[in-house]
């Protein structure tokens, strides 16, 4: 069987300032289990925009219904957009361990830029 | 097979405190969010509060805020509701349950419920 | 608070006959809606979750369907041991709220 990929098939996305920026992506296994999370930036300082598992994140919806368990896209929408927004965003599958989840692989990452409204 | 078994119920005067257990077996208890739901008597059904996996994100009713503390230990496979400053208004049957991942999933395993009863 | 609102409040019907129970939320729950089952004395029990996805274990007469603010429970042939008191719960965001519960009695 081959190994999951996490696929983020935009490597850029623009969004006007105030408007929703949707972020795709998709798995190719639903193996192994375990959860996504959505991070903007990479490394230890990466900032957690969603998580599947835990916690109810207001700005972020996502784009179809996580609790469908063949589900494999985990694609997300943030809502009202500012300039503090941009930066790359990265969707990354965890893999189920106790007594922590253990990272398992990430998506390229998609570049978001925010252009400023018209004045 | 799933098993959630609530504890600590009984008769109290207002204003005094409980503590309710939820004993899970028959699933890995850290891989789940918690909830307490309660039902006065003849009643619907009021979610009271909720704990996810690792307690990093934890949400009260407004009815509860200030008065009722969540809270779990993944290592004794417990999850735990303290209940202060208790009101005739929480006499209740105080059901725990669990709910797979995020904050989007159902309650797909629920206790048999232990009841509270405030009075003087 | 969304809240949620369900219809009827409670319903006489016979075995073998088709029973609809709908559910309207003050805002849109997008597919975040689940139903569950009590009996008397008894803890609720999960049926439909995320609108129209049947339980596993629950008999298949059980369907649930709806988008948005308006969603349906429906049960195409009563049989005697569903007769109970059914509610709504919707986990789009915090409160979890409840639907205020449908009885549905034998005629």
């Known amino acids: 069987e081959e190994e999951l990929q996490v696929i983020q098939p935009d490597k850029f996305v623009l969004v006007a300032a105030g408007e929703t920026a949707t972020l795709r992506c998709t798995a190719t296994s639903l193996i192994p289990v375990g959860p996504i999370q959505w991070f903007r930036g990479a490394g230890p300082g990466r900032e957690l925009i969603y998580n599947q598992k835990e916690g109810h994140f207001p700005r972020v919806t996502t784009v179809s219904d996580l609790t469908k368990r063949n589900n494999m896209d985990f694609s997300i929408r943030i809502g009202n957009i500012t300039p503090a927004d941009a930066g790359t965003y990265y969707c990354v599958k965890f893999r189920k361990g106790s007594p922590d989840d253990v990272e398992f692989k990430s998506g390229a990452g998609t570049e978001l830029s925010v252009r400023a409204k018209p004045s | 097979e799933v098993q959630l078994v609530e504890s600590g119920g009984g008769v109290v005067q207002p204003g005094r405190s409980l503590r309710l257990s939820c004993a899970a077996s028959g699933f890995t208890f850290s891989d789940y969010g918690m909830i307490w739901v309660r039902q006065a008597p003849g009643k619907g059904l009021e979610w009271v509060a909720s704990i996810s996996s690792s307690s990093s994100y934890i949400y009260y009713a407004d009815s509860v805020k200030g008065r009722f503390t969540i809270s779990r230990d993944n290592s004794k496979n417990t999850l735990y509701l303290q209940m202060n400053s208790l009101r005739a208004e929480d006499t209740a049957v105080y059901y725990c349950a669990r709910r797979y991942y995020g904050f989007n999933y159902p309650f797909d395993y629920w206790g048999q419920g232990t009841m509270v009863t405030v009075s003087s | 608070a969304i809240q949620l609102t369900q219809s009827p409040s409670s319903l006489s019907a016979s075995v073998g006959q088709r029973v609809t129970i709908t559910c309207g939320a003050s805002k849109s729950v997008r597919t975040y809606m689940h139903w569950y089952q009590q009996k008397p004395g008894k803890a609720p029990k999960l049926l439909i979750y995320?609108?129209?996805n049947l339980e596993a274990g629950v008999p298949s007469r059980f369907s649930g369907s709806g988008s948005g603010t308006d969603f349906t429970l429906t049960i195409s042939s009563l049989q005697p041991e569903d007769f109970a008191t059914y509610y709504c719960?919707?986990?789009?965001?915090?409160?979890?709220?409840f639907g205020q519960g449908t009885k549905l009695e034998i005629k």
């Open positions: 995320s609108a129209s």
């Open positions: 719960q919707q986990s789009n965001e915090p409160p979890y709220t």
